[in-house]
């Protein structure tokens, strides 16, 4: 066979679908790899060919499009399963070709089983809702293209195992689920099941997502440095270990990059010669507010080190702040014998 541009196995597109449900899978060539769409390719006389490799096999084989009730079919650049079976799991390849041109890409498809409460190995998308922020909605995802607009599906929403009904602040509204006032108690997995008829058969689409209630932008503040502060003085003798924690609280902000860093005499620790290490730990509140702690450590501090300026800096989308640590050299206590002698008026 002549040369074919092989884009390999596109593991970025790890497609997971539920067993016994319809699935429509677009050939990734037109979405990620080629600069033209299927219509252009088709008009130019290119043919789209599908084949697959079963799970735990090496042999590529053509897809059987002659199954009863057209269980697997192709429509333009979409491979359809109506519905999927567990043993459809494997690597699927779509190849676009004519006598002079060839391009192909493979992608993994995993058919997943769910339990009676919709739990499964499926990787769930996370939808963040702001706490006590007014009405917010989530929409049943990835159901476009399964049925024409003339078909009116029924949609049932579940939280975990239970149909959503008579919830105080959560209201199913067709494809949308409305949260009147999102609270921490609304955290969890939400499932919509879309039921629609097609050619005398009933199909179901199950979609689960995780709702995480996070801090509201109404309550967001610039970073707050809890430590260092004016109440704590780091008093050390030369040779001792100097440990200064920088503890910063960040309000949750969607897509904000939270940063904490130290400067020593106005320079980043990496840019100076002293032997300094910095360890960072991060913790989150229930609403994903973040507390970052960076501990600056100098194992054997020198007199020179104790004269330097140690400043903790923090930045988020809400602003930038800085706070200097109070560092000083401990004055040695007078020696006991000298002190006594002075006390008795000895010269």
């Amino acid at each position: 066979s002549e040369r074919c541009d092989d884009w390999g196995l596109d593991t970025m597109r790890q497609i997971q679908v539920f067993e016994d449900e319809p699935a429509r899978i677009k050939c990734p060539l037109f979405e990620h790899f080629l600069k033209f769409n299927y219509s252009t390719a088709h008009s130019a006389g290119l043919t789209l060919i599908w084949y697959w490799t079963r799970q735990d096999r090496d042999l590529e084989e053509p897809i059987n499009f002659r199954l009863p009730e057209n269980r697997i079919s192709k429509e333009k650049d979409v491979l359809w399963f109506r519905p999927t079976l567990l043993n459809d799991t494997g690597n699927y390849t779509c190849m676009l070709r004519n006598t002079t041109y060839c391009s192909k890409v493979a992608f993994p498809l995993e058919v997943v089983q769910k339990d009676s409460c919709f739990n499964s190995p499926m990787k769930l998308p996370v939808h963040k809702l702001y706490i006590e922020y007014g009405i917010q909605r989530i929409t049943c995802p990835n159901v476009d293209g399964y049925f024409p607009s003339s078909v009116k599906p029924t949609i049932t929403w579940y939280m975990g195992c239970y149909k959503i009904q008579n919830f105080n602040n959560v209201i199913p509204e067709g494809m949308n689920l409305s949260f009147l006032i999102a609270l921490i108690s609304n955290n969890g997995n939400y499932t919509c099941v879309v039921t629609y008829p097609e050619n005398g058969r009933t199909f179901h689409l199950t979609r689960t997502l995780t709702v995480k209630v996070v801090g509201s932008p109404k309550n967001a503040v610039p970073p707050v440095i809890h430590s260092p502060n004016d109440h704590v003085v780091y008093e050390k003798e030369p040779g001792e270990e100097l440990l200064i924690p920088c503890t910063v609280y960040f309000s949750f902000l969607m897509d904000s990059r939270n940063e904490v860093w130290w400067t020593i005499d106005g320079k980043k620790p990496d840019d100076i010669t002293i032997d300094v290490t910095i360890n960072e730990s991060i913790s989150h509140s229930r609403t994903e507010d973040e507390t970052r702690t960076q501990i600056l450590s100098i194992k054997k501090v020198t007199s020179e080190d104790l004269k330097r300026s140690y400043v903790c800096h923090a930045r988020s989308a809400k602003g930038e702040v800085a706070k200097a640590a109070k560092v000083k050299q401990k004055v040695p206590a007078p020696r006991y014998t000298v002190e006594l002698a002075c006390g008795f008026g000895a010269t």
Epitope: D20, L85, Q113, K114, D115, S116, K163, Q165
Partner: antibody
Framework: QVQLVQSGAEVKKPGSSVKVSCKAS????????MNWVRQAPGKGLEWMGR????????HYAQKFQGRVTITADKSTSTAYMELSSLRSEDTAVYYC??????????WGQGTLVTVSS | DIQMTQSPSSLSASVGDRVTITCQAS??????LNWYQQKPGKAPKLLIH???GLHAGVPSRFSGSGSGTDFTLTISSLEPEDVATYYC?????????FGGGTKVEIK
């Protein structure tokens, strides 16, 4: 297409047990609920319980709790309903009914169980 | 358990007539209501799910409506093959419960 084929009619003595089977085909047995519903002669429908063969989860109507056991054999795509301590008022047609969610989309042909001394 | 009350218990209508059957739940069931058709000596068949969703393959003369506690099954133009008993069933809260049935006959 979905088919549910139930076992044949049974005549049982009071106090004994009956086990009715329901063999499923045409869909993925482990992905749907299997319900059991009964209908006494000339009467309405009465839901007894259900099983999700995928994980074995069961729910029973309080009325039958302790007397009914619903099981499923994934290897043969067969569901079973066993009713014990039979009495004359258990004489009825017993149906299995499959549903991906809660509605019972497809039903078996029914099994007549007669309880008589 | 939720009680489902159907009315009328039986009715007789002519071919082509519009037929309406009602079902009342003892408490709100949030549209979680199915309608089944059972012909003499046969197993029930699902007609309508979730109050108004027509099951695959069911003729469009059947329709369902309602909300809360009151629901209706309508046959827009009665056909001879519609002779059957019709049952409503709630699936809001376990255990699922059925109405007593409405027997539809042709005059």
């Amino acid at each position: 297409q979905v088919q549910l084929v139930q076992s044949g009619a049974e005549v049982k003595k009071p106090g004994s047990s009956v086990k009715v089977s329901c063999k499923a085909s045409g869909y993925t047995f482990t992905s749907s609920w299997m319900n059991w519903v009964r209908q006494a002669p000339g009467k309405g429908l009465e839901w007894m319980g259900r099983i999700y063969p995928g994980d074995g989860q069961t729910h029973y109507a309080q009325k039958f709790q302790g007397r009914v056991t619903i099981t499923a054999d994934k290897s043969t795509s067969t569901a079973y309903m066993e009713l014990s301590s039979l009495r004359s008022e258990d004489t009825a047609v017993y149906y299995c009914g499959e549903g991906y969610l809660d509605p019972m989309d497809y039903w078996g042909q029914g099994t007549l169980v007669t309880v008589s001394s | 358990d939720i009680q489902m009350t159907q009315s009328p218990s039986s009715l007789s209508a002519s071919v082509g007539d519009r037929v309406t059957i009602t079902c009342q739940a003892s408490q709100g069931i949030n549209n979680y209501l199915n309608w089944y058709q059972q012909k003499p000596g046969k197993a029930p068949k699902l007609l309508i799910h979730y109050t108004s969703g027509l099951h695959a393959g069911v003729p469009s003369r059947f329709s369902g409506s309602g909300s809360g506690t009151d629901f209706t099954l309508t046959i827009s133009s009665l056909e001879p093959e519609d002779v059957a008993t019709y049952y409503c069933q709630q699936y809001s809260i376990l255990p699922w419960t059925f109405g007593g049935g409405t027997k539809v006959e042709i005059k």
